[in-house]
């Protein structure tokens, strides 16, 4: 018997043990977060699977993820949303210390999918562990990209109060209009609920004392946000290591000086 032809994509295949990983993460998350104890993880997995299984992996839509979004509905208290762009690790380190602030990956759906890849095949119930579409080389409407677009949009839409965003000051484009933050989240903050966006620009070099809040891309972000009737603030974080240390120990005498 000849092996059935399988579509070859340019990206890496589905993460090994993907179903088990999603289910295990869901169980762990709902055990740790009392407000999500009502979540039925089998239903969550069924909804996740239903979004991409048997579907052509370059034709996934936001509609496909609506059951999963509904089952994973969660709210963040006002002033506690932390967005990030190109600086995920530091953002996550921060929310691990500052437990009352939340990135998307601290929410159930973001937690389930963080660092995972997945895709299926048209008209079969199989998961493709060999290859999945690459955003640039194959298509943008792939299961992973559409998932993050969907949940990022919802995360931004439900944010309220003062929203914070952590940006990477070491990159040539500190604010990148093509990032998820720049293309999705910025445009889905709701002016009637969000009073301000405060950007934290994280410096890379120890001796870097420039005011990166004056960077042209930050001015572009300020313009976009202001046009949406949301106030904009910007802070330089010159010493990210000290910044985290001071979040952990705000009483430390060295934290009274600038970070």
């Amino acid at each position: 018997v000849l092996p059935r032809w399988r579509q070859q994509w340019s990206g890496s295949g589905t993460t090994s043990r993907f179903p088990e990983t999603v289910l295990a993460r869901c169980v762990k998350y709902t055990e740790v977060h009392p407000e999500m104890r009502h979540v039925d993880c089998q239903s969550v997995w069924d909804a996740f699977k239903g979004a991409f299984i048997s579907k052509y992996p370059c034709n996934i839509t936001e509609e496909d993820y609506q059951p999963l979004v509904k089952l994973g509905t969660q709210t963040v208290p006002c002033n506690k949303t932390l967005l990030w762009s190109r600086i995920k690790d530091l953002a996550h380190q921060f929310t691990q210390v500052q437990r009352d602030m939340f990135t998307l990956e601290d929410m159930l759906l973001g937690y389930l999918a963080d660092d995972l890849t997945w895709c299926g095949e048209f008209n079969t119930f199989e998961i493709n562990y060999q290859s999945c579409p690459d955003w640039r080389k194959d298509c943008s409407n792939n299961p992973v990209s559409v998932f993050w677009k969907t949940v990022s949009r919802r995360f931004a839409e439900t944010a309220c109060g003062v929203v914070h965003v952590m940006l990477n000051g070491s990159r040539s484009k500190i604010f990148d209009k093509n990032s998820t933050f720049g293309s999705v989240e910025v445009h889905n903050l709701q002016p009637e609920k969000v009073q301000a966006l405060e950007a934290w620009v994280i410096h890379g070099g120890r001796e870097d004392s420039r005011d990166l809040c004056q960077d042209p891309t930050i001015k572009e972000l300020e313009s976009i946000i202001s046009k949406r009737n949301i106030r904009f603030f910007c802070k330089n974080i010159y010493r990210p290591d000290k910044f985290l240390q001071c979040v952990k120990n705000p009483e430390d005498s060295s934290c009274l000086s600038g970070i």
Partner: antibody, heavy 120, light 111 residues
Framework: EVQLLESGGGLVQPGGSLRLSCPAS????????MTWVRQAPGKGLEWVST????????WYADSVRGRFTISRDNSKNTLYLQMNSLRAEDTAVYYC???????????????WGQGTTVTV | QSALTQPPSASGTPGQRVTISCSGS????????VSWYQQLPGTAPKLLIY???QRPSGVPDRFSGSKSGTSASLAISGLQSEDEADYYC????????????FGGGTKLTVL
């Protein structure tokens, strides 16, 4: 044959309670979300409540939240709607409908009962 | 006041093509699948279209659905007298607490 058959409607005083039942037959009941929809006399359809296939999660319209409770017994293939603190504006024909399957092949209400009338 | 807006009435003569619109917003139609229902006088609703464009088996191909942005449409070609009914669009709502939303319904009269 796939069938839904609502019962439990009737005449009730404002502030009273009723429990609607909807036994299902002809399909794997435990594999589908289920929904209640109502229609006031001469009016359009109004979504009331939806429950997932396992019964683990439910949603309610603002107009009934806190007063109505949707539930299901998969061992009896039956959907329920417990209606408390009934008001005149709850007067309607109540339909139960088969909703999204847990394969998520579609989101729609593809099988409907004949309806049961509730008069407050 | 329905979250989805439909014209209250529409009409056509036998054989004609009629289109019923359903207008919503980014919090419902734009990111969710739309379904359409037919309700003949004195009967329960019946599913006509699901997932924006799909027809359940048994529904004639005279009925077709489409969606663009925050609006959806139901088209009925080769109108027949038995098509006289109320037609409703529905979709998932993105609010935190709700699920389905319906249009107000369109009464189709075959002249």
């Amino acid at each position: 044959e796939v069938q839904l058959l609502e019962s439990g409607g009737g005449l009730v005083q404002p502030g009273g309670s009723l429990r609607l039942s909807c036994p299902a037959s002809g399909f794997d009941f435990s594999s589908y979300w289920m929904t209640w929809v109502r229609q006031a006399p001469g009016k359009g359809l109004e979504w009331v409540s939806t429950i997932t296939d396992s019964g683990g999660r439910a949603w309610y319209a603002d107009s009934v939240r806190g007063r109505f409770t949707i539930s299901r017994d998969n061992s009896k293939n039956t959907l329920y709607l417990q209606m408390n603190s009934l008001r005149a504006e709850d007067t309607a024909v109540y339909y139960c409908a088969r909703d999204t399957p847990k394969t998520y092949y579609y989101y729609a209400m593809d099988v409907w009962g004949q309806g049961t009338t509730v008069t407050v | 006041q329905s979250a989805l807006t439909q014209p209250p009435s529409a009409s056509g003569t036998p054989g004609q093509r009629v289109t019923i619109s359903c207008s919503g917003s980014s919090s419902n139609i734009q990111y969710s699948y739309v379904s359409w229902y037919q309700q003949l006088p004195g009967t329960a609703p019946k599913l006509l279209i699901y997932n924006n464009v799909q027809r359940p088996s048994g529904v004639p191909d005279r009925f077709s659905g489409s969606k663009s942005g925050t609006s959806a449409s139901l088209a009925i070609s080769g109108l027949q007298s038995e098509d006289e009914a109320d037609y409703y669009c529905a979709t998932w709502d993105e609010s935190l607490l709700g699920l389905w939303v319906f249009g107000g319904g369109t009464k189709l009269t075959v002249l």
